[in-house]
Structure formats: structure tokens, C-alpha cells
């Protein structure tokens, strides 16, 4: 029950996160004009990954797409790529996780298959979230760098008579949406990975127990399994019993807490 809840919650959290990543990627307000030095501007500028916008004194907003690909800064291209990779991985992860949900029955799908799918989707969500967080953080870093660069030469003019206020940009709403969405996707992915452990069927490792027949010193090994805790004979570790040299394979083994008969 707890596993199903964890898996379901992980799916929902990731779904919200990926929806947020998509929203952030499409939003125009990645960077917005800093109004600290010019609070009375009638022309408000803001920019997204795909276009830049200007809201004018009439209330009209004009947006223009970045119609060039080669002319754009490499960092912007990198952010675009990270966000798209995040969305693609997240979308695939969602698709996989739908089929992995314990509450959904698809044919005679085994729990082991569902566990693998849950783990796969979990990893995809984690990478998706990291991509979004990385993309947003790279853009934020770019903004901070440009902000302080433009602050250094804030005012230019002719003899100090005419002031030209250089437009500075600060964090837009999309950055916060992206950070939160990336975090949610990451958390959802971790939850899916945790759920996977609970979904995986316990490995039925039948350990052999040797029984001594009365009057005989022959060890019976039922089922043809080796009576050892290792993965094969250990000829290095020789133990001496009753003056006779026997390999560990020949030594009577007692059921440990990990052995199920």
C-alpha cells in the first residue's frame, strides 16, 4: 500500500514538475527590466528564451521572436537545449511511469517489469529535473553577470548633461517557476526510485542445508544447490575438521537470517 502511494505521489509530483518545466520554457518572463533605477519607465522590457517583449504606455505589449539561430548567444542556446532535453526526458518518463503504476493493470505484466519501469522513469525524472535546474541556473548566472556589468557603466551621456539609462535585467517569474518545477520533478523521480525498491520482488534465494544421515558422514545437498554462502567453491579458505581436510563446500552450513527454505 505504501509502495503504491509513494509511486502514485511520485508520478503526480513529477507530472506537476514537468508541466511547470514546459510552462517555464514557454514563458516570456525569463528576464525582466530592473525598475530600481528607473521606476517611472512607461516602456517595460522583458525577455524569454524564444522572444523579447515590450509593454508600452498604452498597455499594448509587442513581442518579437528571435528569428536568428546563429546570432544568438551560446549560453541562450545551451539553456534552450537543457530545457528541451528536460521536457523530452520528462515526457518519456511520464509515459513509462504510466505503465509502471501499480494501480494500473496491463495484461500479465510482472512486478519485476513494473519495478524496472518505475526505476527507469524515476531516473528520467531526476535527470529531467536536473536539466531544468541547470538551465535556469545558467540563465540566472548570465543575468547576474550582465547586471553587474551594466551597473558598472550605468550612465553614459554627453558631458553629464543628458542621461541615458542603460536597461538592466533582473530575474523574471519563469526562473522561479523553472527552479520549483525542476525541484518537483527531481523529488518525484526520487520517490519513483524509492517506490521501485518496494516493488521489486524479494529474491527467493533457496540456500541448501546439508543433513547428516545417521552413521554416515555424507552431506546431502537437496535440489542440487551448493551448500555455500559464496558463489562457487572457495578452495582458498581450508578449514580442518576431525583431522580431515575438507573444503568449505563440504562443511555443514546452517540457515542464516537471509536463507529461506
Amino acid at each position: 500500500m505504501a509502495v503504491t502511494a509513494c509511486q502514485g505521489l511520485g508520478f503526480v509530483v513529477s507530472l506537476i514538475g514537468i508541466a511547470g518545466i514546459i510552462a517555464a520554457t514557454c514563458m516570456d518572463q525569463w528576464s525582466t527590466q530592473d525598475l530600481y533605477n528607473n521606476p517611472v519607465t512607461a516602456v517595460f522590457n522583458y525577455q524569454g528564451l524564444w522572444r523579447s517583449c515590450v509593454r508600452e504606455s498604452s498597455g499594448f505589449t509587442e513581442c518579437r521572436g528571435y528569428f536568428t539561430l546563429l546570432g544568438l548567444p551560446a549560453m541562450l542556446q545551451a539553456v534552450r537545449a537543457l530545457m528541451i532535453v528536460g521536457i523530452v526526458l520528462g515526457a518519456i518518463g511520464l509515459l513509462v511511469s504510466i505503465f509502471a503504476l501499480k494501480c494500473i493493470r496491463i495484461g500479465s505484466m510482472e512486478d519485476s517489469a513494473k519495478a524496472n519501469m518505475t526505476l527507469t522513469s524515476g531516473i528520467m525524472f531526476i535527470v529531467s529535473g536536473l536539466c531544468a535546474i541547470a538551465g535556469v541556473s545558467v540563465f540566472a548566472n548570465m543575468l547576474v553577470t550582465n547586471f553587474w556589468m551594466s551597473t558598472a557603466n550605468m550612465y553614459t551621456g554627453m558631458g553629464g548633461m543628458v542621461q541615458t539609462v542603460q536597461t538592466r535585467y533582473t530575474f523574471g517569474a519563469a526562473l522561479f517557476v523553472g527552479w520549483v518545477a525542476g525541484g518537483l520533478t527531481l523529488i518525484g523521480g526520487v520517490m519513483m526510485c524509492i517506490a521501485c525498491r518496494g516493488l521489486a520482488p524479494e529474491e527467493t534465494n533457496y540456500k541448501a542445508v546439508s543433513y547428516h544421515a545417521s552413521g554416515h558422514s555424507v552431506a546431502y545437498k537437496p535440489g542440487g544447490f551448493k551448500a555455500s554462502t559464496g558463489f562457487g567453491s572457495n578452495t582458498k579458505n581450508k578449514k580442518i575438521y576431525d583431522g580431515g581436510a575438507r573444503t568449505e563446500d563440504e562443511v555443514q552450513s546452517y540457515p542464516s537470517k537471509h536463507d529461506y527454505v
Epitope: 512607461a42 516602456v43 523579447s52 504606455s57 498597455g59 509587442e62
Partner: antibody
């Protein structure tokens, strides 16, 4: 056809208040701010402020902050400007203007303040 | 506040003449976001509201005759009427559309000789 129709002329006593209306038609009323201007012989054209019909947000010229109050009625696509404590200095023609770059103006409302 | 200074305050011309009037702003009206100058020119005839002629310092409003041309950038702007006609006699205002409060110039009155 886009139109901004303003209310008629007003003759007011000093200290009184007046409300001027501006009825918009022919465009999406909530998509553009409604701006108000004052034109007198003394000061040419002066911007009073604007109201965003979508949410009622306003912005005023500091000079008119205590003089003018802008309101809007979305249902009738009408903007209003209330002028209080009128003095002779408030005698002027008041215009409403909207759309991009004030492409459309009302015909103007003459307010005369006289004892 | 941005101060808009228009010159001359009045112009007396004859029909067919070329007319130039200037407008200066105390601050740059250039918006770096879209590289547009937020300066607007209006024409006002007696008893009428102002009429939009030029926006973004040089873009002509639709329906405005092409004899009206706006130019300039930053703080210095010009309105040119290539061949003045009788119906052009009016007061011309420039307006700062870049910063609140929006401000207008005192106007240039165009009169016939």
C-alpha cells in the same frame, strides 16, 4: 469604428466636484489603458494619468494625484475621471485617449470653473 | 520628469514650402529593448483633439500623408513637412512616450503667410 465619446461641457463653482465620462466602442476595451489629458491655454497638454480597464490599476502624474480620481465600468466600457476641489486653475479641456500611441482621442470636455 | 522643448514656437510659411520643426528631450527616449525611440508627434487643429502623426520618432501612422516625415534619435528629433498644404496649418506637439509622467512639448504653431 473606434470611438471615444466624452460627456458634455461643465460649468462648476469653485470647491465643487465634477465627473467626466468617456465611453469607448469599436475595440477591446480591456486591452488598452485609458489615459486622461488636460489642455489649458497656460500649460498646453498635460498628462493626468491612466487606468487599466482590465484590473482597475491606476497611475497618476504626481501633480494631479490629489485632484483626479480615475475609475472604470467594464460592463458599459466607460471610463470616468472625477475632479475634486475645483479652482479656476482647473478650467480646461479634458481629453481621454486610448489605443497604441494615443491613436484615438475623445472630442474633449470643457470644464469651466467660475464663481 | 522629462522636459520636452520644441522650436520654433511658431512658423509662418507659404503653401508648397518645406518646413522643419525640432523637438529636444532632457533624457534619451531610446528603448534598448527594441531599439525604438519613444517619441510621438501629434497634429492639433482648432476645436479638435490631437491627431497621431508619427510614432517611434519616424514611423508614420496609417492614413497620414507621406509628406510628413519624422527623424532623429536619443534626444534630438525633427518633424519635416516636405510641401506644406493649407490643411496642414495646425499646432504640432511632440510627446515623450518613454517615461512617466508622459510629457508634451509646448507645441509649434504653423501659420500661413
Amino acid at each position: 469604428e473606434i470611438q471615444l465619446q466624452q460627456s458634455g461641457p461643465e460649468l462648476m463653482k469653485p470647491g465643487a466636484s465634477v465627473r467626466i465620462s468617456c465611453k469607448a466602442s469599436g475595440y477591446s476595451f480591456t486591452s488598452y489603458y485609458m489615459h486622461w489629458m488636460k489642455q489649458s491655454h497656460v500649460k498646453s497638454l498635460e498628462w493626468i494619468g491612466y487606468i487599466d480597464p482590465f484590473n482597475g490599476n491606476t497611475r497618476y502624474n504626481q501633480k494631479f494625484k490629489d485632484k483626479a480620481t480615475l475609475t472604470v465600468d467594464k460592463s458599459s466600457t466607460t471610463a470616468y475621471m472625477h475632479l475634486s476641489s475645483l479652482t479656476s486653475e482647473d478650467s480646461a479641456v479634458y481629453f481621454c485617449a486610448s489605443l497604441r500611441f494615443f491613436a484615438y482621442w475623445g472630442q474633449g470636455t470643457l470644464v469651466t470653473v467660475s464663481a | 520628469d522629462i522636459v520636452m522643448t520644441q522650436s520654433p514656437s511658431s512658423l509662418t510659411v507659404t503653401a508648397g514650402e518645406k518646413v522643419t520643426m525640432s523637438c529636444n528631450s532632457s533624457q534619451s527616449l531610446l528603448n534598448s529593448g527594441n531599439q525604438k525611440n519613444y517619441l510621438t508627434w501629434y497634429q492639433q487643429k482648432p476645436g479638435q483633439p490631437p491627431k497621431l502623426l508619427i510614432y517611434w520618432a519616424s514611423s508614420r501612422e496609417s492614413g497620414v500623408p507621406d509628406r510628413f516625415t519624422g527623424s532623429g534619435s536619443g534626444t534630438d528629433f525633427t518633424l519635416t513637412i516636405s510641401t506644406v498644404q493649407a490643411e496642414d496649418l495646425a499646432v504640432y506637439y511632440c510627446q515623450n512616450d518613454y517615461s512617466f509622467p508622459l510629457t508634451f512639448g509646448a507645441g509649434t504653431r504653423l501659420e500661413l503667410k
